[in-house]
Structure formats: structure tokens, C-alpha cells
């Protein structure tokens, strides 16, 4: 093939090489950028900055090499448009530092920075960590900090991410209240901070106030939907990012729903209960307290992380006609109580001729004098059982 006279020449099916001395001062308008997977740049003394706009449109880029050039600064968001980048070689440039944000979100298998006049400060703590953890081929480069010494020797005791403390109200929060949260940020070299409120949606009206080092957030006219929703404070410095999430508990009365019994491995009377704080539950059978056993018991489904409602079943293991009847679920918390009832028929009564069915073992009437709230066992009402051989 004839020699290529351009600043950048095709290399393989999806590569580009730019090696003509001093031909580039930016990476705008590279030919065939959309399909490039490999870009090799060398001897470009005028290429001093790499910024977000430079790599726009290079979404397929996997390998980027900029060597023996004049690169002094790589923007923290420079690789935002190249999420597939896996090899980055910036050796023998004029880089004094490289932000942790530059490589955040990339899955770099290789990062080469040797031959740069790196300057050791907390801003390179992330790179020191890569060296310690054997990431990206960094340890083999034995990186030096200009005028100082090996990166590995840089003291890092003071190189921490910001410390966050979020103050939430101690008092009970009711539906309709306004809630003030405050996020206190401490640490050196604070750069940015803010709130992440993506989970809140319609749970409250949001008003932000203040700035570093103390951020305020007012949640006005809160609803019960605010429960279990994360309110996150974040802050960044030259070392990295810290996040702290809190939840605001909005009190509201208990509620309950019952659904028709369904036959699964066991029978199940499905229910849903809600309330904050979480309500206590009690089952009644035909108006009497139902004492749970290994044959009849409450089972909860795995709760959803972001809601207060709990779903579950009253499980009945091979129920018979004696278990047919009216089931009531009582739910109560300090802000209110609720109940729901449902009729369940598991099996026809084989003793239709006998009007006096035995009382099931596990039930006793509600003792209206009881103050403990626990069922009271009555010794003189011990039921008897009947066993029938069939066939």
C-alpha cells in the first residue's frame, strides 16, 4: 500500500494511527470515528488537553494510546463517551496528575502512565491503591513522583474521602409534616456535594439549601410513601467519593387486607399489612384467638426494600373441615388498628350427620379480661378428638 500522507492513517479494519510530528492539537473530527476500536497517537507535542468533546463519537473505542506527546491535562469526564475503553496508555507525556474520576466507570485492564512527571499528593491515592492491589498493570511500571520518589512510598494517612454525617429528626414524623435533614461534610479538599433523591418521586416536596460543608434538605408535606426510601448525601474530594443514605420514618396507622385462600404446597390465606411502625398481628378463627402451631402459622414473604407493606400467608398444613370458618387478621400500631375477615372452606364436613363437631385443639375464646394481649388457655375447655378409619 502507498504511504499515507495524512496526519492520521487507517490501521487494520478499525484502527487509526496518528504519528506525523506535531500534526494534531486536538482529537476533533477524526476520520471514521464512530467505528474506531483502536486509536494510536504519538509525537503530538501540541496535543496538551484531553477533554469530553475530544472523544465524543468514539463509542466503540477499546484501546487508546497517546504517547510521547504533550498531554498535560486529562479532564475528569474525558472518557464519558468511551465506556468500552479497556486499554489506556498515556506514557511519556507531561501529566502531573490524573483524577480518580477519569477512570471511574471504565473497566480498564491496562493503564500505562510511566514516563510522566507525576506529582504525588492525595489526588493520586487511587493510583497508589491500584499499585497496591495489582490493578491495570500499574505495579510493573514502578511509578515515580517527580522530585519525590516512588508512588508506593507516598504517605496516605491523611488521604481519606470526605466524612459525612446526616442528621435526621429524632421526633416522630407524621403524614403532612415538614422534615429538615442536614448533611455535615468534613474532610480535606472538598470539591462537590449534593443530595440524591431519585427514590422520592411524589413522597414529598423537596427544597435544597446551603452548600459545603453543611447541606440542608427540606422535605415538605411528607406522605407515607416516604418510608423506606433512601435519601442520600454525597460528597467528593480529590481522593474519591463518599455517600451516606438515611430513611425518614413517617408514622401512619395500621391497615390490613385479606385475600381468598389458595391451595399451594400448603393452603395459604394471603394477606397484606401496612403501617409505620410495623403493626403487631393477631389471627382470630370464628371470633376466637388462633394460637399458631407447626400446622397453622404465619409466614412472611421477603419484604421489598423500599416499601413498608408486608405480604404473607397464614399457612395451613393439610387443613380439614374443622378448619373451615371465618378468619380475621387484626393489625395494630400506636397510630391505629385495622382488621379484615374472610371465609375459608378447605374441605366438606364428612360428618354432616353429627352437629357437634369437636372444637379444634389450637383455639380458645378471646378472654375479654386479659390485659396482656396473649391468648389465655382455659383448662376446663380441653377439646376431644375423633378419629375415623375410612374404607
Amino acid at each position: 500500500a502507498a504511504p499515507c500522507p495524512d496526519a492520521c492513517c487507517p490501521h487494520g479494519s478499525s484502527g487509526l494511527r496518528c504519528t506525523r510530528d506535531g500534526a494534531l492539537d486536538s482529537l476533533h473530527h477524526l476520520p471514521g470515528a464512530e467505528n474506531l476500536t483502536e486509536l494510536y497517537i504519538e509525537n503530538q507535542q501540541h496535543l496538551q488537553h484531553l477533554e469530553l468533546r475530544d472523544l465524543r463519537g468514539l463509542g466503540e473505542l477499546r484501546n487508546l494510546t497517546i504517547v510521547k506527546s504533550g498531554l498535560r491535562f486529562v479532564a475528569p469526564d474525558a472518557f464519558h463517551f468511551t465506556p468500552r475503553l479497556s486499554r489506556l496508555n498515556l506514557s511519556f507525556n507531561a501529566l502531573e496528575s490524573l483524577s480518580w474520576k477519569t477512570v471511574q466507570g471504565l473497566s480498564l485492564q491496562e493503564l500505562v502512565l510511566s514516563g510522566n512527571p507525576l506529582h504525588c499528593s492525595c489526588a493520586l491515592r487511587w493510583l497508589q491503591r491500584w499499585e497496591e492491589e495489582g490493578l491495570g498493570g500499574v505495579p510493573e511500571q514502578k511509578l515515580q513522583c517527580h522530585g519525590q520518589g516512588p508512588l508506593a512510598h507516598m504517605p496516605n494517612a491523611s488521604c481519606g474521602v470526605p466524612t459525612l454525617k446526616v442528621q435526621v429528626p429524632n421526633a416522630s414524623v407524621d403524614v403532612g409534616d415538614d422534615v429538615l435533614l442536614r448533611c455535615q461534610v468534613e474532610g480535606r479538599g472538598l470539591e462537590q456535594a449534593g443530595w440524591i433523591l431519585t427514590e422520592l418521586e411524589q413522597s414529598a416536596t423537596v427544597m435544597k439549601s446551603g452548600g459545603l460543608p453543611s447541606l440542608g434538605l427540606t422535605l415538605a408535606n411528607v406522605t407515607s410513601d416516604l418510608n423506606r426510601k433512601n435519601v442520600t448525601c454525597w460528597a467528593e474530594n480529590d481522593v474519591g467519593r463518599a455517600e451516606v443514605s438515611v430513611q425518614v420514618n413517617v408514622s401512619f396507622p395500621a391497615s390490613v387486607q385479606l385475600h381468598t385462600a389458595v391451595e399451594m404446597h400448603h393452603w395459604c390465606i394471603p394477606f397484606s399489612v401496612d403501617g409505620q411502625p410495623a403493626p403487631s398481628l393477631r389471627w382470630l378463627f370464628n371470633g376466637s384467638v388462633l394460637n399458631e402451631t407447626s400446622f397453622i402459622f404465619t409466614e412472611f414473604l421477603e419484604p421489598a426494600a423500599n416499601e413498608t407493606v408486608r405480604h404473607g400467608c397464614l399457612r395451613l398444613n393439610q387443613p380439614t373441615h374443622v378448619n373451615n370458618g371465618n378468619y380475621t387478621l387484626l393489625a395494630a400500631n400506636p397510630f391505629g388498628q385495622a382488621s379484615a375477615s374472610i371465609m375459608a372452606a378447605f374441605m366438606d364436613n364428612p360428618f354432616e350427620f353429627n352437629p357437634e363437631d369437636p372444637i379444634p385443639v389450637s383455639f380458645s375464646p378471646v378472654d375479654t379480661n386479659s390485659t396482656s394481649g396473649d391468648p389465655v388457655e382455659k383448662k376446663d375447655e380441653t377439646p376431644f378428638g375423633v378419629s375415623v378409619a375410612v374404607g
Partner: antibody, heavy 119, light 106 residues
Framework: QVQLVQSGAEVKKPGASVKVSCKAS????????MHWVRQAPGQGLEWIGT????????SLAQKFQGRVTLTRDTSTSTAYMELSSLRSEDTAVYYC????????????WGQGTTVTVSS | DIQMTQSPSSLSASVGDRVTITCRAS?????LYWFQQKPGKAPKPLIY???TLGSGVPSRFSGSGSGTDYTLTISSLQPEDFATYYC?????????FGGGTKVEIK
């Protein structure tokens, strides 16, 4: 023990050059960066630049670029700082100092070389 | 360049006094160094990365601080402590020094 011994005092005319030496002993000369700092009479300390004797890499404060040359001779474990186009405000004591990366600070200093620029 | 501002520029104190010198950086730095210099002598390293005492430095000297504000404290001033003290940063190039604090005998 680790020592840095500098050359003696110099008196120079404006426009001339001066070359100050700093002989290292008691450690591996090529392993540690050597820095140069100056102090004008009654004034504070001012960083000039640094050289890595292992490969002659250098960095200079912007103020001194074009006027200062840092060199080294590994055979004699000596670092040199040459300042050209001297002016009266270059009158100062010039120090060499080693950056000790094990503890990350300027741990050993030369005794200083007084350079006087006077017509 | 990061500017280092020391205060006070000079102070008079007596033997046994507690002395505090402050150093403020124009932007947040990673760590700080303190040097002691006596007339006609080279600076002597006193404290490195903010709070670690240099070799042979008496425990009456201590350093603290973070971000932009740092302090050198001499808990009980001794005759040999009368000197000029300099702070120095190397968070970014070039390394810069404070203007110095001269501690004199009252």
C-alpha cells in the same frame, strides 16, 4: 552518615553565571531527588528546582526556567546548579537538599553557598 | 502556585511559654512540613507530613491541621528554640514556603 557538602562563596558581576556544587556522601546518590532552594538576605525560602541523579530528569520553578541548569556527575556523586544572567536580586544563600522518599521530606541540607551579585 | 501564609511573622516569648504558630494554605493541601532555621545555618526539618516529628526533634514540638489550616506548637519553649520557623507545602508544584515566624526572647 548522610552529608551534603557545598562549594564555597562566590562573588559575581551582573550578567555573569555561577555554578554551585553539592557533593553527596553516605547514601546511594542516584536513588534520591536532589533539590535546590535559595534564601535572599533577611527573606524566606524559595524553591528553584530538582534533579533525579539516576537519569538526569529535572523540574524547575517557572521563574527559573531558561536561567537555571541542573546537572549531575554520578562518578563523583555531585549535583550542580548553574544560574546565568545574574542580577542583583539573585544575591542569596543557595542550598541543596535531598528528598528522602522513605519518610517523604527534605531530610538533609547542605551548609549553603553564598552568591553575591554586585557590580 | 499555592501561597502559604504564616502568622505571626514574629513573636516574643519567655522560656517555658507555650507557643503556637499557624500556617494557612491558599487551597487545600495533602500534608505540611515545618522547618527550624537559626541565623547562618541551613533549615532543619522539624515535622513532616503534618504531625510526624523529624529525627532527634524533642517531643515538646507538635504539628496538627488539615485542609488549609495548620499549626506548630511548642509546649514549653526552651532557650535553644529561639529561631525562625517555616512551613512548606508540596501538594502541587512548585513546593512553596511560608514567609517565616521569628521567635525571639522576651
Amino acid at each position: 552518615q548522610v552529608q551534603l557538602v557545598q562549594s564555597g562563596a562566590e562573588v559575581k558581576k551582573p550578567g555573569a553565571s555561577v555554578k554551585v556544587s553539592c557533593k553527596a556522601s553516605g547514601y546511594t546518590f542516584t536513588t534520591y531527588w536532589m533539590h535546590w532552594v535559595r534564601q535572599a538576605p533577611g527573606q524566606g525560602l524559595e524553591w528553584i528546582g530538582t534533579i533525579y541523579p539516576g537519569n538526569s530528569d529535572t523540574s524547575l520553578a517557572q521563574k527559573f526556567q531558561g536561567r537555571v541548569t541542573l546537572t549531575r556527575d554520578t562518578s563523583t556523586s555531585t549535583a550542580y546548579m548553574e544560574l546565568s544572567s545574574l542580577r542583583s536580586e539573585d544575591t542569596a544563600v543557595y542550598y541543596c537538599t535531598r528528598f528522602y522518599f522513605e519518610d517523604w521530606y527534605f531530610d538533609v541540607w547542605g551548609q549553603g553557598t553564598t552568591v553575591t551579585v554586585s557590580s | 502556585d499555592i501561597q502559604m501564609t504564616q502568622s505571626p511573622s514574629s513573636l516574643s516569648a519567655s522560656v517555658g511559654d507555650r507557643v503556637t504558630i499557624t500556617c494557612r494554605a491558599s487551597s487545600s493541601i495533602s500534608w505540611l512540613y515545618w522547618f527550624q532555621q537559626k541565623p547562618g545555618k541551613a533549615p532543619k526539618p522539624l515535622i513532616y507530613y503534618t504531625s510526624t516529628l523529624g529525627s532527634g526533634v524533642p517531643s515538646r514540638f507538635s504539628g496538627s491541621g488539615s485542609g488549609t489550616d495548620y499549626t506548630l506548637t511548642i509546649s514549653s519553649l526552651q532557650p535553644e528554640d529561639f529561631a525562625t520557623y517555616y512551613c512548606q507545602q508540596w501538594h502541587s508544584y512548585p513546593p512553596t514556603f511560608g514567609g517565616g515566624t521569628k521567635v525571639e526572647i522576651k
